[in-house]
């Protein structure tokens, strides 16, 4: 039994780091493998993660972390019974994938303005809380070409757009994702999408 693709890990910079790797053949990850992880720090002890299958030869492990700070460093040991298959290390702050924003809502009752709001996925005491920026994706269910991205570079989790920038009388969907420049993170997953019917009064045309 050998590791074909070494574990790579990403942290949500809150409580979970996810590690994925591939074995050289079909593997029952949960019965045959264990990933031990230990914070390199005074009086820390190793924790055991039981991996799940992620495709035939792929495994994934969700490492629970009681806290995350910028200086954290973990040792990782992948075991198959008594055999050490791989040894490595992981610094969560260097491999951050933020949590996806939630509670995306489209408010259509503001005169001819669409207000999109969502929730910051971090609590106020988390470092990322004040460092997230967002991308909002809006697309038409009827027209695949009607697809747009709005970059929200301010901290407030909201976006205002004129309803008239979208077509009237058809349904749209929106979703949002986040990233943090300070840790050069990857983008989060997209939030669940929300749907609304876009309708607004066309301005009266004078001839």
């Amino acid at each position: 039994m050998k590791v074909l693709q070494e574990p790579t890990c990403v942290s949500d910079y809150m409580s979970i780091s996810t590690c994925e790797w591939k074995m050289n053949g079909p593997t029952n990850c949960s019965t045959e493998l264990r990933l031990l992880y230990q914070l390199v720090f005074l009086l820390s002890e190793a924790h055991t993660c039981i991996p799940e299958n992620n495709g035939g030869a792929g495994c994934v492990c969700h490492l629970l972390m009681d806290d995350v700070v910028s200086a954290d460093n973990y040792t990782l040991d992948l075991w198959a019974g008594q055999q050490l298959l791989w040894k490595g290390s992981f610094k969560p702050s260097e491999h951050v994938k933020p949590r996806a924003p939630g509670n995306l809502t489209v408010h259509t009752n503001v005169s001819d303005t669409l207000l999109l709001t969502w929730s910051n996925p971090y609590p106020p005491d988390n470092y990322l809380y004040n460092h997230l920026t967002y991308a909002v994706n809006i697309w038409s269910e009827n027209d695949p070409a009607d697809f747009r991205i709005y970059n929200v570079t301010y901290l407030e989790p909201s976006l205002r757009i004129a309803a008239s920038t979208l077509k009237s009388g058809i349904s749209y969907r929106a979703r949002v994702r986040a990233w943090a420049q300070c840790y050069n993170t990857t983008w989060s997953e997209w939030s669940p999408s929300t749907k609304w019917h876009n309708s607004y009064r066309e301005p009266f045309e004078q001839h």
Partner: antibody, heavy 118, light 107 residues
């Protein structure tokens, strides 16, 4: 509510022994490392000893190494400090403290006073 | 052993003042530094952990900064209950060591 209650202090002659206890409540005791910190009368804080959640890792201050032994009983939510060959300079208020996983003591007991004198 | 040197050892100030206490480590301790407040006859109370994180329940007038060897604790708008003793503590390596303390007195 986290509570740490120390006991076992008292007046003891130099060269004798004493065993301190700390009873913990309000948190999952076996998830955290625990420590003893002392404070001589009118002086500053001095770390004495600490041990990890399952006792696989232990540290001592040089001043107590070889004389003091830290231990814990997770089933009883208790931390102990066995103090042998006590010296007058061991006279202090001994605090039990919970380790906050990133190098800080987030909860402290009220302390138990140990006086070493003939 | 890592020596922690606090300065000043005592400082006089008035209610409403801003005070800064510094702590210097004899070698690099990254961000593994905490600050405590101790009132007479009481156990120490954690104020700041990992150099700059405010402990839950601690008033926002307290703040910490620094990394490596130089750290500061700042108290903005001093309140009457703040006139006590403050300690820094490193946890980069054993033995864990404390600064000698800074006593904050009223002018």
């Amino acid at each position: 509510e986290v509570q740490l209650v120390e006991s076992g202090g008292g007046l003891v002659q130099p060269g004798r022994s004493l065993r301190l206890s700390c009873e913990a409540s309000g948190f999952t005791f076996d998830d955290y490392a625990m420590h003893w910190v002392r404070q001589a009368p009118g002086k500053g804080l001095e770390w004495v000893s600490g041990l990890s959640r399952t006792s696989v890792s232990i540290g001592y201050a040089d001043s107590v190494k070889g004389r003091f032994t830290i231990s814990r009983d997770n089933a009883k939510n208790s931390l102990y400090l066995e103090m042998n060959s006590l010296r007058p300079e061991d006279t202090a208020l001994y605090y039990c403290a919970k380790w906050g996983t990133r190098g800080y003591f987030d909860y402290w007991g009220q302390g138990t006073l140990v006086t070493v004198s003939s | 052993d890592i020596q922690m040197t606090q300065s000043p050892s005592s400082v006089s100030a008035s209610v409403g003042d801003r005070v800064t206490i510094t702590c210097r480590a004899s070698q690099d301790i990254s961000i593994w530094l905490a600050w405590y407040q101790q009132s007479p006859g009481k156990a120490p109370k954690l104020l700041i952990n990992v150099a700059s994180r405010l402990q839950s329940g601690v008033p926002s007038r307290f703040s910490g900064s620094g990394s490596g060897t130089d750290f500061t604790l700042t108290i903005n708008s001093l309140q009457p209950e703040d006139f006590v003793t403050y300690y820094c503590q490193q946890a980069n390596s054993f033995p864990i060591t404390f600064g000698q303390g800074t006593r904050l007195a009223t002018k």
